[in-house]
């Protein structure tokens, strides 16, 4: 149990203890949410105190202060997903429609996702906001007719499901055009449905 002497400058529990060179002893670190209010000596272990409101320490530590809580920066495109507590900093992520463009231990700057052109859609990512859009072509039988960062390819309309016949096949950028079976289709007419 700390404090105890250590000649080789290492402690038994690296996570919860630290080496104090002045006295050549191992002392307890303070748990998350606390800081060192009195340093250890040969006869007394570290004394810890709870972080004040609006401050935190995330790890077992031998810090003499707690870190100040900071809000996520909306100017940098960040939004909050979880508040700061005495044991963790504010948790941030990119706002919807944005991705992380600058990373330094955590995301510091988000930018707008690129549009995917007609005929394509953004490849689904494991984690939202992690990277810019990678646009992939619509699979067979699907279309997407806008330039958008988030539009998804939709299945072509099946004319027969509506009691209609196909006037023009769908493409990656456009839906199938349907018409009434009784109508003959003049070549210049277009549109998704001709009635």
């Amino acid at each position: 149990v700390p404090p105890y002497g250590s000649e080789n400058q290492t402690c038994r529990d690296q996570e919860k203890e630290y080496y104090e060179p002045r006295h050549r002893i191992c002392c307890s670190r303070c748990p998350p949410g606390t800081y060192v209010s009195a340093k250890c000596s040969r006869s007394r272990d570290t004394v810890c105190a709870t972080c004040a409101e609006n401050s935190y320490n995330e790890h077992w530590n031998y810090l003499t202060i707690c870190q100040l809580c900071r809000p996520c920066d909306p100017v940098m495109g960040l939004e909050e997903i979880a508040p700061c507590t005495s044991k963790r900093k504010t948790q941030c992520r990119c706002q919807p429609g944005m991705f992380c463009a600058a990373w330094a231990l955590e995301c510091t700057h988000c930018e707008l996702l690129s549009d995917c052109p007609p005929g394509t859609e953004a490849e689904l990512k494991d984690e939202v906001g992690k990277g810019n859009n990678h646009c992939v072509p619509c699979k067979a039988g699907h279309f997407q007719n806008t330039s958008s960062p988030s539009a998804r390819c939709q299945p072509h309309t099946r004319c027969e499901d509506q009691g209609l016949v196909e006037a023009a096949p769908g493409t990656a950028q456009s839906d199938t055009t349907c018409r009434n079976p009784s109508e003959s289709l003049p070549p210049e007419m277009s549109g998704t449905m001709l009635m």
């Epitope: 609006n54 909306p74 997903i81 979880a82 508040p83 507590t85």
Partner: antibody, heavy 116, light 107 residues
Framework: QVQLVQSGAEVKKPGSSVKVSCKAS????????LHWVRQAPGQGLEWMGW????????QYNEKFKGRVTITADKSTSTAYMELSSLRSEDTAVYYC?????????WGQGTTVTVSS | DIQMTQSPSSLSASVGDRVTITCKAS??????VAWYQQKPGKAPKSLIS???YRYSGVPSRFSGSGSGTDFTLTISSLQPEDFATYFC?????????FGQGTKVEIK
């Protein structure tokens, strides 16, 4: 000591808007989040959103997005919650609360009645 | 959103009784849970934060425990002034959510 003093009761018509104020004192207004929580008659508590007066940025519960606006005036240490397109289900007591690991400090509440 | 399921919704007890209220989160919220007491016509009053930390001025008969998804508020010996409604709340992630409340009534 920390105090949050809210504006008085309001009676509003359906479709109109209401703006409730919350004047803070006893602490540095710009360094703490102020939240709004409501409670319908005989019901539980429902979190609406917060404002961080330091940068006047607000974040909202998706349920209220587009209908609620939370603002703050640093010069008077006052936060405001405006709710628009009121309906009868918005009849409730609206509370402001200062957060730190929950809500240690609450305003006294403002009763908003929506009735035609 | 994280659901906080509180039970029981109401209970009848006598002065001196030990009362236990439970709250179950729909997903892990660590110890980021607070408990409140509310009396009719009044704002909620903070009792507990970080699942078990009792606010200064709150009598020692109130205690909180739990972590992850299961939390408990215990009143060791119910006093006349404790008859009220109690709410749990998670502040682990937005949107913050509350339990539906437990009304403690006089038997």
């Amino acid at each position: 000591q920390v105090q949050l003093v809210q504006s008085g009761a309001e009676v509003k018509k359906p479709g109109s808007s209401v703006k409730v104020s919350c004047k803070a004192s006893g602490y540095t207004f710009t360094t703490y989040y102020l939240h709004w929580v409501r409670q319908a008659p005989g019901q539980g508590l429902e979190w609406m959103g917060w404002i961080y007066p330091g940068n006047v940025h607000a974040q909202y519960n998706e349920k209220f997005k587009g209908r609620v606006t939370i603002t703050a005036d640093k010069s008077t240490s006052t936060a405001y919650m405006e709710l628009s397109s009121l309906r009868s289900e918005d009849t409730a007591v609206y509370y402001c609360a200062r957060s730190w690991e929950g809500f240690p400090y609450w305003g006294q509440g403002t009763t908003v009645t929506v009735s035609s | 959103d994280i659901q906080m399921t509180q039970s029981p919704s109401s209970l009848s007890a006598s002065v001196g009784d030990r009362v236990t209220i439970t709250c179950k989160a729909s997903q892990n919220v660590g110890i980021n849970v607070a408990w409140y007491q509310q009396k009719p016509g009044k704002a909620p009053k903070s009792l507990i934060s970080s699942a078990s930390y009792r606010y200064s001025g709150v009598p020692s008969r109130f205690s909180g425990s739990g972590s992850g998804t299961d939390f408990t508020l215990t009143i060791s010996s119910l006093q006349p002034e404790d008859f009220a409604t109690y709410f749990c709340q998670q502040y682990d992630t937005y949107p913050f959510t509350f339990g539906q409340g437990t009304k403690v009534e006089i038997k």
